[in-house]
């Protein structure tokens, strides 16, 4: 049975060139977390594992750094990274859950943090 | 090229024991989660074990926890099943499986290793 | 657990035909769904993971969607090399499990 719930930092949004943590969190459960995976769309981010630490996609070795914690800092901003990421936490034995942030980069200096929310 | 080669099956009491083997190539062993699936003589597919790339986590259904023990040697990329307490129930061909780094599917199966639990 | 419902449980098409196998998961699974083919005498291969998701070196006419408790597996134009048998799995939850699989077969 899944008890848990995913919060995550919600709607945000930076400034383009800037830098931007996202960053989930699983909690009212006490299932062990497997890995992290850390999507933009259907892209791979990066991976968190238990056993074997980070894992960042080559393709964002340059402007994505790992953490804090299980969170993942996206640097170097531009327009074209606004959009959805996701968190996936692969829990033994609860299973998957999934966290979703919308990220906006702006061009001016206006942005500001959303709300947080969560996702069961 | 990913090759995952079974070993150790064969016609086993019930209540006896048997220990599988899968010798692993063509990829970083220690990088990736490996399980056991088992396909019974009805053609159904049963996940059997899970163990994380370090060793460190492993997880098991119900019905063989307690009985079976996964592992693995990361140094003679090998993976094996140690199974106690075998039932006719656990008559099937036993594969071994590679998980994609995601952890979303088993991209690569071997061949599989038959077990027969019978008197 | 989760069970996994597939339909129908065998199929007899056309070559070219479109086919599509079903899978129905008894709780919400998400996106969490995977399609595995394994020809006759043969092993199980991934061809879709995340229900839509084409695995590597998976031919285009392979696709797949849902989310949910519905999924579909949809094979277009179909050929002589797809004759296999074809199986759901749901990695939403421990015990992961596998649908009963579908066998096509070629008219």
């Known amino acids: 049975m899944m008890t848990g719930t995913i919060e995550t930092t919600g709607n945000i949004s930076a400034e383009k060139g800037g830098s931007i943590i996202l960053q989930c969190h699983l909690s009212s459960t006490t299932a062990q977390v497997t890995q992290v995976n850390w999507e933009q769309q259907d892209q791979l981010l990066a991976i968190c594992n238990a056993d074997l630490g980070w894992h960042i996609s080559p393709s964002f070795k340059d402007r994505v750094a790992p953490g804090p914690g299980l969170g993942l800092t996206l640097q170097s901003l531009t327009v074209n990274d606004t959009g959805e990421y996701f968190c996936i936490y692969h829990t033994y034995p609860d299973g998957t859950y999934t966290g979703r942030i919308f990220l906006e980069v702006l061009e001016s200096s206006v942005a500001e943090h959303g709300a947080r929310f969560q996702i069961p | 090229e990913v090759m995952l080669v079974e070993s150790g099956g064969g016609l086993v009491k019930p209540g006896g024991s048997l220990k599988l083997s899968c010798a692993a190539s063509?990829?970083?062993?220690?990088?990736?989660?490996m399980s056991w699936v088992r396909q019974t003589p009805e053609k159904r597919l049963e996940w059997v074990a899970t163990i994380s790339g370090g060793g460190g986590n492993t997880y098991y259904p119900d019905s063989v926890k307690g009985r079976f023990t996964i592992s693995r040697d990361n140094a003679k990329n090998t993976l094996y099943l140690q199974m106690s307490s075998l039932r006719s129930e656990d008559t099937a061909l036993y594969y071994c499986?590679?998980?994609?780094?995601?952890?979303?599917?088993?991209?690569?199966w071997g061949q599989g290793t038959s077990v027969t639990v019978s008197s | 657990d989760i069970q996994m419902n597939q339909s129908p449980s065998s199929l007899s098409a056309s070559l070219g035909d479109t086919i599509t196998i079903t899978c129905h998961a008894s709780?919400?699974?998400?996106?969490?769904l995977n399609w595995y083919q394994q020809k006759p005498g043969n092993i199980p291969k991934l061809l879709i993971y995340k229900a839509s998701n084409l695995h590597t070196g998976v031919p285009s006419r392979f696709s797949g969607s849902g989310s949910g408790t519905g999924f579909t597996l949809t094979i277009s134009s179909l050929q002589p090399e797809d004759i296999a048998t074809y199986y759901c799995q749901q990695g939403q939850s421990y015990p992961y499990t596998f649908g009963g699989g579908t066998k096509l077969e070629i008219k």
């Open positions: 063509g990829f970083t062993f220690s990088s990736y989660t």
């Open positions: 499986a590679r998980w994609l780094l995601t952890y979303y599917a088993m991209d690569y």
């Open positions: 709780q919400n699974i998400n996106v969490w």
